[in-house]
């Protein structure tokens, strides 16, 4: 319960902070686990203890072990755990999942994303950021005090985030890097596949030879703003543009409507002066976003006029 | 006949990117929506993502972001599928898979796959 | 997302047998199934979609049901060519995902 993980790479500064709290009057003592050695406090060693901080400058790989913490008070004493890992430095650019920090979230709304630990560090502004090994470049992003802010937050910007700055110890500079995943969700809504509401699949619709018909394609998309989604009619697999029937037009825009908050598209087809040529036609309707794409057919039949005759 | 061929075996070393192509006959490439599917050896299948050519634009899985590209080439009916910052574990035979005509979730044609080895 | 669970893992049967695969889905998708047939060496076949229709060219000894959260593959006479691995396939939602395979052995 009282034992924390860190880790850190070689040559990089790490401090860590031992997991049992107290007053900053009581005393901590440092211990090396598997020796019981105790961690000089003097800060010209490479490892020190510094209250409730033992500091790596620089950590080796050969620090790696696990460390003791005493917190000391006149009434009682508490002891603490600090499991120390010290990885070589990756040659290439993967970050592996032994050196990530937990992931955060964010969304157009909400896109900060903190440098882990850097509140242990001394530490001077600005910070340096980097997405998958790529120094971060442009307006849309901002290093604000401890954290990186990104504008216009798109799906896009879900990766590997590192941040690195410079920790100073009695006037030495060391390096400090921590990475952690940034994923993106919209508050705003949701997408899904396309529902497509109407025609329904496989539908004959019946039409009067010489008069003018409508067939409408609806779909829902999810909730909110949807980013590219489109309902159109295809005729016999082709685009109805590209189709060459001038009497077979699709509405030009499409209609947008909410359906018990979803978002949904509509769009109609209209055919002018019905033709028997017309009821051969496959007529599809196809709903499509970025999760894929549904199609219902729809197929024309003859609807016999009434006899008006008495 | 419907059919996709895809591009021959590659190897690559960890860091590097890859490549794979995916070229469709017998149909209208840019009706249907075309999936990158892989397999590692003697593992099951995993989505990566994919693509309908006619918006251009393409659906990645959460895993795959950021390290995936898929575009698609309407002139010349192929689909690409390209992996960066490759590391071991992407040693896989790669799929390309077209979705159905009435649900592009369905795959009903399969690539015949290509191997892709990470090694240093 | 969502989680395609397969069971068994593996089966020996003989041939004329009737083999049943089940797959259970970490929240309801409807009817959004799909069944694919899988041999060494070679790229997975469309099976069955929607849960139960079977795709055109596939012998009508293999069928599917279910809807919600549980579906069945059914062989109902195995035949020599059906030994391969079977995979269930979700198509509810993005991510799309599989399930770990029934890989049907020789018994």
């Known amino acids: 319960k009282f034992s924390k993980q860190s880790w850190g790479l070689e040559n990089e500064a790490l401090i860590v902070r031992c997991p049992r709290q107290g007053k900053p009057s009581y005393t901590v003592d440092w211990y090396y686990s598997q020796t019981n050695k105790s961690i000089p406090t003097q800060e010209r060693n490479r490892v020190f203890a510094s209250g409730q901080l033992l500091k790596f400058l620089p950590a080796a790989v050969a620090d790696s072990g696990i460390y003791t913490c005493i917190v000391r008070s006149p009434t009682f004493n508490r002891t603490g755990y600090a499991n120390v890992t010290i990885y070589k430095k990756q040659s290439d650019c993967n970050v592996p999942d032994y050196l990530m920090y937990s992931t955060v979230s964010g969304s157009e709304k909400n896109s900060k994303i903190y440098c882990p630990t850097i509140d242990l560090y001394n530490w001077t502004a600005p910070l340096e950021w980097f997405k998958n090994c790529q120094a971060l470049q442009g307006s849309r992003y901002r290093a604000h005090k401890s954290f990186l802010v990104i504008d216009n937050v798109m799906t896009e910007d879900a990766g590997d985030y590192t941040c690195k700055f410079i920790h100073n110890e009695n006037g030495a500079n060391y390096s400090v890097t921590a990475t952690r995943s940034f994923t993106v969700k919209d508050e705003q809504g949701f997408s899904l596949f396309p529902v497509i509401g109407a025609p329904a699949q496989n539908e004959i619709k019946e039409v009067e030879i010489g008069k003018n018909a409508n067939l409408t394609c609806s779909a829902c998309f999810g909730k909110g703003t949807q980013f590219l989604a489109a309902v159109l009619w295809q005729l016999n697999g082709t685009k109805i543009t590209d189709f060459g029937e001038p009497r077979i037009q699709q509405e030009e825009g499409q209609n947008q409507s909410f359906s018990n908050g979803l978002a949904c598209l509509d769009m109609v087809l209209r055919i002018a002066d019905v033709k028997e040529e017309d009821l051969l036609l496959q007529y599809d309707c196809l709903a499509l976003n970025l999760h894929g794409l549904r199609r219902h057919t729809v197929r024309l039949s003859r609807k016999n006029p009434i006899d008006h005759h008495s | 006949q419907v059919q996709l061929v895809q591009s021959g075996a590659e190897v690559k070393k960890p860091g590097s990117s890859v490549k794979v192509s995916c070229k469709a006959s017998g149909y209208t490439f840019t009706n249907y929506y075309m999936h990158w599917v892989r397999q590692a050896p003697g593992q099951g299948l995993e989505w990566m993502g994919g693509i309908i050519p006619i918006f251009g634009t393409a659906n990645y899985a959460q895993k795959f972001q950021g390290r995936v590209t898929i575009t698609a080439d309407e002139s010349t009916s192929t689909a690409y599928m390209e992996l960066s910052s490759l590391r071991s574990e992407d040693t896989a035979v790669y799929y390309c898979?077209?979705?159905?005509?009435?649900?592009?979730?369905?795959?009903?044609?399969w690539g015949q796959g290509t191997m892709v080895t990470v090694s240093s | 997302d969502i989680q395609m669970t397969q069971s068994p893992s593996s089966l020996s049967a003989s041939v004329g047998d009737r083999v049943t695969i089940t797959c259970r889905a970490s929240q309801s998708i409807s009817s959004y199934l799909n069944w694919y047939q899988q041999k060494p060496g070679k790229a997975p076949k469309l099976l069955i979609y929607a849960a139960s229709s079977l795709q055109s060219g596939v012998p009508s000894r293999f069928s599917g049901s279910g809807s919600g959260t549980d579906f069945t593959l059914t062989i109902s006479s195995l035949q020599p060519e059906d030994f391969a691995t079977y995979y269930c396939q979700q198509s509810y939602s993005t991510p799309l995902t599989f399930g770990g395979g029934t890989k049907v052995e020789i018994k």
């Open positions: 898979a077209r979705g159905g005509y009435y649900d592009s979730s369905q795959f009903d044609i």
